[in-house]
């Protein structure tokens, strides 16, 4: 997260981290007592190794009472996400046991009327990912306050020139902006899930090349297809 | 398929009013910016500006920022370029082009010509 | 405003030739974003533009790959690698890096 500040401890209990081989890869989001949410790409390069989550978490070295490291069952990607596009980064982490719920770790409602967010609207972004262009990485959880962009400001030539469809949207980045490290993490706008991190390589802080986010409520039929 | 189609063009004398249409279908209409650009009679291109569907936000070349107005009805998916105080000079083919991705997708132009 | 001119204003070629239009900027069309916003653009009489090249060297879908584009800064370059009778028609280059966005003044290539 860049140009935002440390997250009030344990205030986001659906907040996850996919971790790989003990490592922070990404964040996720806990939609279901054994299901979190998270972004297709980030486990493309994860063939040969140990996919894992962390729920309950602040400090991702400190410990702490809440915090709990669940293997993974199932990584269920979108069926149609291709490693070179944006669309469809979405993907679902079957936990290998329901997750324990307390004040720590709690599912999040996600949206599920397709209707775009008001431009201008503030989203909350948290995460563990980068927090300067050094790429220095934070122990403590994350997070920022963005705008929602309007998708034609987000399609035009100097921003997106027209990648944003229907199914993603954008989130101002000047300065302040999820980054590297923070994909597979929740855009909540108004206490529900709105968005995912998307996992492309993007430039960050950069206030023409706006964040981007999957909505959710595009993939409502998938994600209720996949936790049945 | 992204379409959009121009009409309203004609023959105007100098001083007179004209609105263009263009009417955008295949797409979702607030998704993109649309921009409207002319050509003169064996002459280049030259954009007049830009509108957000959203917003309605604009931005126009200098030269057109007295005479010409842009609008919306997003309820039709419909830009409109509104010229006012035509001179001959003003004779040209006009395009609407969706913004996204570049200038991919055009109009097929409506020829104005001013003339008494 | 940035102008660009185009160089030849017109040329004649012959099948299977290889053409080069330049275009040159009054000033850098690098956007403060790091990107440069340099198309190229294919028209036919009576029709609308097609899109061929953007951000520089970028072929657009669908566009043959006899068509490319280079340069930097304030020189760019549209090369078609072996001209085909359908090539036959007026380019235009384009900067969208700075508003008020313009074009090239047309280069027409003719048959000779």
């Known amino acids: 997260i860049l140009g935002g500040r440390e997250a009030e401890a344990h205030a986001r209990p659906y907040m996850a981290s996919v971790q790989l081989n003990g490592a922070h890869l990404c964040g996720g989001v806990l939609v279901a007592e054994q299901w979190v949410l998270s972004a297709a790409h980030c486990l493309e390069d994860a063939a040969d190794g140990k996919v894992q989550v962390l729920l309950g978490a602040h400090s991702l070295s400190q410990p702490e009472p809440s915090k709990r490291l669940y293997d993974v069952l199932r990584a269920v990607p979108h069926p149609d996400s291709q490693p070179d596009t944006i669309d469809h980064d979405l993907l679902l982490l079957q936990l290998s046991e329901k997750a324990t719920l307390g004040p720590a770790v709690r599912p999040l409602p996600w949206q599920r009327v397709d209707r775009d967010v008001a431009p201008g609207t503030l989203c909350d972004v948290a995460g563990w990912g980068i927090v300067n262009h050094a790429g220095r990485r934070p122990d403590s959880l994350q997070h920022v306050l963005l705008p929602v962009l309007d998708r034609a400001t987000c399609n035009r030539r100097t921003h997106h020139d027209g990648a944003i469809t229907e199914r993603l949207m954008c989130a101002e980045s000047n300065r302040r902006d999820s980054c590297k490290g923070d994909s597979g993490g929740p855009l909540v706008c108004g206490g529900v899930l709105e968005g995912v991190v998307t996992s492309g390589s993007r430039v960050c802080g950069n206030r023409k090349k706006p964040g981007i986010y999957t909505r959710v409520a595009s993939y409502a039929a998938w994600i209720d297809s996949v936790l049945a | 398929e992204v379409q959009l189609v121009e009409s309203g063009g004609g023959l105007v004398q100098p001083g007179g009013s004209l609105r263009l249409s263009c009417a955008a279908s295949g797409y979702i209409f607030t998704s993109y910016y649309m921009n409207w650009v002319r050509q003169a009679p064996g002459k280049g291109l030259e954009w007049i500006g830009d509108?957000?569907?959203?917003?309605?936000?604009?931005d126009y070349n200098a030269d057109f920022k007295r005479r010409f107005t842009f609008s919306l009805d997003t309820s039709k998916s419909t830009a409109y370029l509104q010229m006012n105080s035509l001179r001959a000079e003003d004779t040209a083919v006009y395009y609407c082009?969706?913004?996204?991705?570049?200038?991919?997708?055009w109009g097929q132009g409506t020829l104005v010509t001013v003339s008494s | 405003d940035i102008q660009l001119t185009q160089s030849p204003s017109s040329l004649s070629a012959s099948v299977g030739d290889r053409v080069t239009i330049t275009c040159r900027s009054s000033?850098?069309?690098?956007?403060?974003?790091?990107?440069?916003?340099l198309e190229w653009y294919q028209q036919k009489p009576g029709k609308a533009p097609n899109l061929l090249i953007y951000k520089v060297s970028n072929r657009f879908s669908g566009v043959p790959s006899r068509f490319s584009g280079s340069g930097s800064g304030t020189d760019f370059t549209l090369t078609i690698s072996s001209l085909q009778p359908e090539d036959f028609a007026t380019y235009y280059c384009f900067q969208g890096s700075h508003v008020p966005v313009t074009f090239g003044q047309g280069t027409k290539v003719e048959i000779k």
């Open positions: 000033q850098t069309i690098v956007h403060s974003n790091g990107d440069t916003y």
């Open positions: 509108i957000n569907p959203v917003t309605g936000d604009t």
């Open positions: 082009t969706r913004e996204g991705p570049s200038f991919a997708y």
